[in-house]
């Protein structure tokens, strides 16, 4: 089968109430079939590529475990399995200040060096 291209799928928006939790869905495809090398998953807020990171985790070669390196205020937790092309993120104890746009990103290292980030992101509406 032909190699897949990089793509990311996120919904335009997610709505939730302050104090509740929300899930920011993000799935991706990539051209590196059977990739099992080092992987980093990142979520940032505000703007793509340059916005501040709110979550980051890293998985070692051959591992499905994406070890959390950053979770802003301890409120961000990865639900998706990056090895299954899913970066879905759970945000706990929502505050009005969380009402912004969020962007998911995945990075491959090791034998393959490649990365991809959602351009449009998902808008989180907190009411």
């Amino acid at each position: 089968s032909p190699a897949q291209r990089w793509s990311m799928q996120v919904p335009p928006e997610v709505s939730a109430e302050a104090g509740d939790a929300a899930v920011l869905p993000c799935t991706f495809t990539h051209p590196h079939r059977h990739y099992d090398g080092p992987l980093t998953a990142i979520w940032r807020a505000g703007e793509p590529y340059a916005g501040p990171q709110v979550f980051r985790c890293a998985a070692a070669r051959g591992s499905e475990l994406c070890q959390t390196a950053l979770s802003l205020h301890g409120r961000f937790r990865l639900l998706g399995n990056p090895r299954r092309n899913d970066l879905s993120l759970r945000v706990e104890r929502l505050a009005l200040a969380d009402d912004r746009r969020y962007f998911c990103r995945v990075e491959f290292a090791g034998d393959v060096h490649d990365r991809y980030e959602s351009r449009h992101g998902v808008r989180l509406h907190v009411t």
Epitope: H34, Y35, A60, L65, Q67, L79, G80, N81, R83, D86
Partner: antibody
């Protein structure tokens, strides 16, 4: 050949802790994730958490996060699962399982024989 | 957490007949479902991974299918040694979650 050999059955009182071991052989222990899965009597399977022995990184099911600690000793190729504040509902067979992979697919390819933990006053 | 619901809970099939077990996920889990067989007093054993891939040494009478939310394990011609409980498991989301199990018996 790959083998996971677990420690023997345990009887514990409510409120106590238990530590179950899982000794691996036949493969390079630090490279593969090891998960712990439990099965209450006559019930289904429940994933508790995972460790990557090479890095020592762990991930837990939120249900158990406050009470479970998973560790690994690469010098002896042994993974451990410690569960604290035991209650009667923790009576179960506890399994370790290797998370093998093939061409970018992960799966539980080898399981320990199971360790029965009985919690009773 | 993702809920995996198997049907039926138990199944009695004549030797040589087909057995079909269904597994429904509470949300889309792609093709990230494995099937495990557990015989009485034994540890689970891997049958199928990634929905359709038969694990090494597993007889070809075992077939997996499905994606998204609906998955099926089929035993095309039931043998006596297939008496066991069968579990589906999703690994698309953490925590990994299993179905409640389907007990397969001989009619």
């Amino acid at each position: 050949q790959v083998q996971l050999v677990q420690s023997g059955a345990e009887v514990k009182k409510p409120g106590a802790s238990v530590k179950v071991s899982c000794k691996a052989s036949g493969y390079t222990f630090p490279r593969y994730d090891v998960s712990w899965v439990r099965q209450a009597p006559g019930q289904g399977l429940e994933w508790m958490g995972v460790i990557h022995p090479g890095s020592g990184g762990t991930g837990y099911n939120e249900k158990f996060k406050a009470r479970v600690t998973i560790t690994a000793d690469t010098s002896t190729s042994t993974a451990y699962m410690e569960l604290s504040s035991l209650r009667s509902e923790d009576t179960a067979v506890y399994y370790c399982a290797r998370r093998g992979l093939n061409k970018g697919y992960w799966f539980f390819d080898f399981w320990g024989q199971g360790t029965l933990v009985t919690v009773s006053s | 957490d993702i809920v995996m619901t198997q049907s039926p809970d138990s199944l009695a099939v004549s030797l040589g007949e087909r057995a079909t077990i269904n597994c429904k996920a509470s949300q889309n889990v792609g093709s990230n479902v494995d099937w495990y067989q557990q015989k009485p007093g034994q540890s689970p054993k891997l049958l199928i991974y990634e929905s359709t891939n038969r694990y090494t040494g597993v007889p070809d009478r075992f077939t997996g299918s499905g994606s998204g939310t609906d998955f099926t394990l089929t035993i095309s011609s039931l043998q006596a040694e297939d008496v066991a409980v069968y579990y589906c498991m999703q690994s698309n989301f953490f925590p990994f979650t299993f179905g409640q199990g389907t007990k397969v018996e001989i009619k």
